[in-house]
Interface confidence: medium
Amino acid sequence: QSSERRVVAHMPGDIIIGALFSVHHQPTVDKVHERKCGAVREQYGIQRVEAMLHTLERINSDPTLLPNITLGCEIRDSCWHSAVALEQSIEFIRDSLISSEEEEGLVRCVDGSSSSFRSKKPIVGVIGPGSSSVAIQVQNLLQLFNIPQIAYSATSMDLSDKTLFKYFMRVVPSDAQQARAMVDIVKRYNWTYVSAVHTEGNYGESGMEAFKDMSAKEGICIAHSYKIYSNAGEQSFDKLLKKLTSHLPKARVVACFCEGMTVRGLLMAMRRLGLAGEFLLLGSDGWADRYDVTDGYQREAVGGITIKLQSPDVKWFDDYYLKLRPETNHRNPWFQEFWQHRFQCRLEGFPQENSKYNKTCNSSLTLKTHHVQDSKMGFVINAIYSMAYGLHNMQMSLCPGYAGLCDAMKPIDGRKLLESLMKTNFTGVSGDTILFDENGDSPGRYEIMNFKEMGKDYFDYINVGSWDNGELKMDDDEVWSKKSNIIRSVCSEPCEKGQIKVIRKGEVSCCWTCTPCKENEYVFDEYTCKACQLGSWPTDDLTGCDLIPVQYLRWGDPEP
C-alpha cells in the first residue's frame, strides 16, 4: 500500500457513513515519507471492516430502525497513521463537496449542458479512527465541514474538549478514568516508586500526564518518565530498557501508558537484553488482553497487569466472520491479501495472488483456527449503531409519520445530526446502556487483566478485577497467590524507631536515608528531630519527652 493508490470498501445505500480502520499497520520510520503502510491487520483491520459491513446489514434488515432507509458505507484504511488518515479523510470531504454542488447527482458540464452521471453520495458521519492522535487530526478536518465523528477506541482526554473538537463523540470513556484506575492499582499494592513509559503521541502523552498528576496527589513518586514512538527501532527500545534498569531494584513497576506495539517493542527489548522477570508492567488499554502484543514474548510479559475496556465478545459477529472465505467474499477488497497473510500461502489464480508465498492455500483453511475476536469489537459495533440511532431520531423529528428520507432531511445537516447523536440513548450490543455526556464521552468501566503462566509454556490473560466509576475491585490472591509474592516498588524502606527521613537534594520525596536522632532528641515529625528541654529526656518510644525525676542527694548517699 503506497500513497498513490488506496483501496476503498463500498456498500451502497440512501445514506453513506464513512469509516476509518487500521487495515494495515502504520508505516515504519523509513517508509513514513512515502506513506507506505505495513502488513495487513486482522483484529484492528479486517475484523472491523467486516463488523461494519455486517452491522449495516443487520440495521438494514431491522424494520424498527430507519424504516425505508438503507445505510451504506465507505471504508478507508487509516494505517494507524495521521498522514494516511488525513489523506483518506480529504477523500470523504471531496465526496461531500462535489455532492453539495450538484443537484440530485446531475453534473453540470463546462459547456453548460447537463450529464446524467450520478456522483457519489456525501458522507454524513465517520466512524473511527482507532488512534487518538489520528482521530484528533481527522476531527480537525471533519469539523470544518460539520461532519460528526464517532470513535470506538480513541480515548485521549483532549478529545473531551468540545471547544476544540465539537463534532467528536465516542462510545468509550476518556483516559482520565483509565489513569485513575492505574493509580488506584499502584496505591493498592503500596508501590510508591515507579518508572513511567508512554507512547509518543496524544494517547500516551495525555494519559501519562494524567497518571503523573494523580500519582503526585497520592504521594506516588515517578523514578523517571520516558517516551518512545511505537515504530521506534530496536536501538531506541534497548536504550529505553537500559535506562529503566538503572532504577532497579527500587522501581520494579513500570507504568506504561502505551499503544500495544510499544509494549511489544519493550518485550522484545527485554528478550534481547535478558530482562525477563525484572519488571512488572502495568499497562493501559492499548495492551489490554491482546495476543498480538505478547505472542512469542510471553516469558517477558508474565505478571503484567493491564487495563481493558469492558466489552464482552460479540457472538453474532463470530457466527458471521468465521464463515467468510476468499472465494465468496468480494465486497471486502482487503480480504484476499489478509487471507494470504494469515495462512502464509498463495491464493492461486486470484486477482490479488501474492507470489511471495510458496505454499498454495488449500480449501480446508478456516478462520476458526486460532481465532481471537478484536477486544474492541463491541465498541466498533456500538459506534455504528450510535450513528444509526442518531439518524433514526433525526428522521423521526424531521419526517414525522413518514417512512424514508423526507425533503426536510435532505441533504443531511451535520449540525442537526450532531444534536440528535448527543441525545442518543440505546441498549448496546452487550446489553449496556450507550449514552453520551455533554462532552460526547461515554461512562468508564474497565476490567483488570493479569498475564499469567497457566501451565508449562501456556500463558493467558486472566480477569483479576474491575474498575467501575471510581471503585476498584481486585482479586489479590489470583494476582499474587500469596502475600509474600507481592512485588515491592519502593525507593526507601520506612525508618526505624527514633529515626527521621533525610531527603537528599534533588531527590524525589519517596527517596530518603534514615538518620537516628541524637541521644537527647525525640522524633518531632518524620523529617525532624527536636532536643528535649533541660530537665527532660526522650521517652522510650522516642516520640516525646518526660521530665527527669528530681533526685535529692543527702550526705550519707553512696556515690552514683
Partner: antibody
Amino acid sequence: SLEESGGGLVQPGASLTLTCTASGFSFSSNYWICWVRQAPGKGLEWIGCIYTGTGITWYASWVNGRVTISSTSSTTVTLQVNSLTAADTATYFCARGSGDIAWAWDLWGQGTLVTVSS
Amino acid sequence: DVVMTQTPASVSAAVGGTVTIKCQASQSIYTNLAWYQQKPGQPPKLLIYKASTLASGVSSRFKGSGSGTEFTLTISGVQCADAATYYCQCTGYGSSGWTFGGGTEVVVK
C-alpha cells in the same frame, strides 16, 4: 571463528586495547559479543558484553568504569581496560552469545595473554 | 550481579562412574543457566544451555537439570576425556549478568 589480538606485556597504570575479530560470520547479525578473563590457575571471570545489533553494553559490577567495550566494524569488537594492575594479568577470551541457544556462548576465541608487570 | 556458587571445587571419579556437580544462584534465574567444559590451554566449550538443553555435538552422557536457584550437571559413564574443569554460568544476562561459578575440577581415575 573468533580471534583475540593485542595481548602482551603491559606496564602497571597503562591502558590496553584488545580486539576480537570474527571470520565466517558478521557482527551485523544480532549477537552478544562478550569478554571473559582467566587469571593463571583460576576460574573464568565475566567482564562485559556488547549487543552487536544495537550497541548496548552490559558490564560486570566489579568493572567500575575501568572497561569499555565497543564495536568498531561489522567484524571487530574491542575491549579497552584502563589503569592496569598486576591483578589484571590473565588470558582474555572473547565469546559469542546467540539467541538461538538462549544467549549461551557457543563460539570462543583461543584467548590472548596479558601480563601486567614492570 | 547474580552470584553463582559451584560445589564441589574438585571431584574424582572412576571410569564408568557418575559425577554430580551442583550450582546455586543467589537469586532466581529461571532456567537461564549454561554449563561449560574447559581443558588446560583451551577455551571453554558449551555443553548445556537453558539449564537442560544439550548443545550441538555434545554426548548425551551429560545431563543438566534444575531451575530457579538450584542446578545440577550429571556426567554418567565417565570417560578419561571428561577430565576437565566444569563451569556453570548464569545466562540471565541483563541485570543478572553472565557470571560464572567458581568451577569444579573433575579428575578421572
